[in-house]
C-alpha cells in the first residue's frame, strides 16, 4: 500500500518571536528514504528541515526520530519571524540508487501566518 503523509492542520497562526509546531505523520517508513520539510512548491521551494542528521538553526524535531518505528516527523520552529510565513510541506522521499532521492508523497501543506507582536 502506498505511503500516506498527513499534515492535519491546514493553517497555523503564530506571533512573531514565538514558536510553532508543524505536525506531520506518515503511514509507513517504506520504501526507505528521508523525510524533509519545504516551504513553497516547485523549483523555488526552500528546504526547511531534513531528518538526515544535519543541524538546522531554530528548527528541531518534536518526537524521538531515532526510534526505528517512528512515524512522527513534526517540527518545532522557534523565534518565528515574518519571513517564515508561507505554506510548509512534509515530503517523503525514496532514496536514490546513485541518483538523487525521488519524491514519492507530500502532505497537503500547512500555511503559517505570522502575526505582529
Amino acid at each position: 500500500t502506498e505511503v500516506k503523509v498527513t499534515q492535519p492542520e491546514k493553517s497555523v497562526s503564530v506571533a512573531a518571536g514565538d514558536s510553532t509546531i508543524l505536525n506531520c505523520t506518515v503511514t509507513s517508513l517504506l520504501p526507505v528514504g528521508p523525510i524533509r520539510w519545504y516551504r513553497g512548491v516547485g523549483q523555488s521551494r526552500l528546504l526547511i528541515y531534513s531528518f538526515t542528521g544535519e543541524h538546522f538553526p531554530r528548527i528541531r524535531n518534536v518526537s524521538d526520530t531515532t526510534k526505528r518505528n517512528n512515524m512522527d516527523f513534526s517540527i518545532r520552529i522557534s523565534n518565528v519571524t515574518p519571513e517564515d510565513a508561507g505554506t510548509y510541506y512534509c515530503v517523503k522521499f525514496q532514496r536514490g540508487s546513485s541518483e538523487p532521492d525521488t519524491e514519492i508523497q507530500s502532505g497537503g501543506g500547512t500555511e503559517v501566518y505570522v502575526l505582529a507582536k
Epitope: L29, L30, V32, P34, D64, T66, K67, R95, S97
Partner: antibody
C-alpha cells in the same frame, strides 16, 4: 572528537553474567541512537542490540533476545549491555557504535574482550 | 550464517581498482554501509547511506548501488588498504542490522 570507550570485559565462567559499559564523549550522547556489535575470534561482525536516543525503545536480533539487554544513562553519557547465561560462543570482542540517522554506524569504540571459559 | 553476501576474498595490484560487492537485502527496505577493519583494530566506517563518505575517509573509497547489489570501489589501491571489508545494512522492515561475512582484500 567523538570517543567511545568500552569497559567491563574479562574472563567469566559459562552460565555467569556480565555488564559492559561504553563511555561516550565528544558529541551530544542523548541525541544519538547507539548499538552493540561483537566479533568472535577469527569471525565477522554481529549486531547485538540497538537503543533509541531517549532509551525507551530497544532492538535485538533473535539470536540474543531475552538474554542480552541494552540500556543507557544519558546523565552519565554511558551505554550498557547486560549479558546473562553466557556460553563459550559469547567469547568475542564487544564494540559499541554510534548510529547515523538511518541506523547505520559512523563511530566505533576500540572494543572490550569477553572470554567465557571454564 | 550472514544475511548479506560478500566474496570471501579479493586480490588487486597496487594502483589498480578494487571492487567488492554485497547483495541479499531488499532495495526498498535496506540502507547499506561499508566498514574497514585491520588486524587487531576496531572497524572504521568508510561509507554509510549507500554512498556517503565521512570527511576523514580518502576520496579513493566510494560506494554505489544498483538494484539489490551495492559495491565498494577502491580506486588506486595502496598497500595500506589491505584489510577486511564488511558490508553492513539496516533493514527497516525488521529493525535489524545484518552484516556480510567480510571480504579480505589482498594487495599483491
Amino acid at each position: 572528537d567523538v570517543q567511545l570507550v568500552e569497559s567491563g570485559g574479562g574472563v567469566v565462567r559459562p552460565g555467569e553474567s556480565l555488564r559492559l559499559s561504553c563511555a561516550a564523549s565528544g558529541f551530544t550522547f542523548s541525541s544519538n541512537a547507539m548499538s552493540w556489535v561483537r566479533q568472535a575470534p577469527g569471525k565477522g561482525l554481529e549486531w547485538l542490540a540497538g537503543i533509541s536516543a531517549g532509551g525507551s525503545d530497544t532492538y535485538y536480533p533473535a539470536s540474543v533476545k531475552g538474554r542480552f539487554t541494552i540500556s543507557r544513562d544519558n546523565s552519565k553519557n554511558t551505554l550498557y549491555l547486560q549479558m546473562n547465561t553466557l556460553t563459550a560462543e559469547d567469547t568475542a570482542v564487544y564494540y559499541c557504535a554510534r548510529e547515523t540517522w538511518n541506523h547505520l554506524f559512523d563511530y566505533w569504540g576500540l572494543g572490550t574482550l569477553v572470554t567465557v571459559s571454564s | 550464517s550472514y544475511e548479506l553476501t560478500q566474496p570471501p576474498s579479493v586480490s588487486v595490484s597496487p594502483g589498480q581498482t578494487a571492487r567488492i560487492t554485497c547483495s541479499g537485502g531488499s532495495y526498498s527496505s535496506y540502507y547499506y554501509a561499508w566498514y574497514q577493519q585491520k588486524p587487531g583494530q576496531a572497524p572504521v566506517t568508510l561509507i554509510y547511506s549507500d554512498d556517503k563518505r565521512p570527511s576523514n575517509i580518502p576520496e579513493r573509497f566510494s560506494g554505489s548501488s544498483s538494484g539489490t547489489t551495492v559495491t565498494l570501489t577502491i580506486s588506486g589501491v595502496q598497500a595500506e588498504d589491505e584489510a577486511d571489508y564488511y558490508c553492513g545494512g539496516y533493514d527497516q522492515s525488521s529493525y535489524t542490522n545484518p552484516f556480510g561475512g567480510g571480504t579480505k582484500l589482498t594487495v599483491l
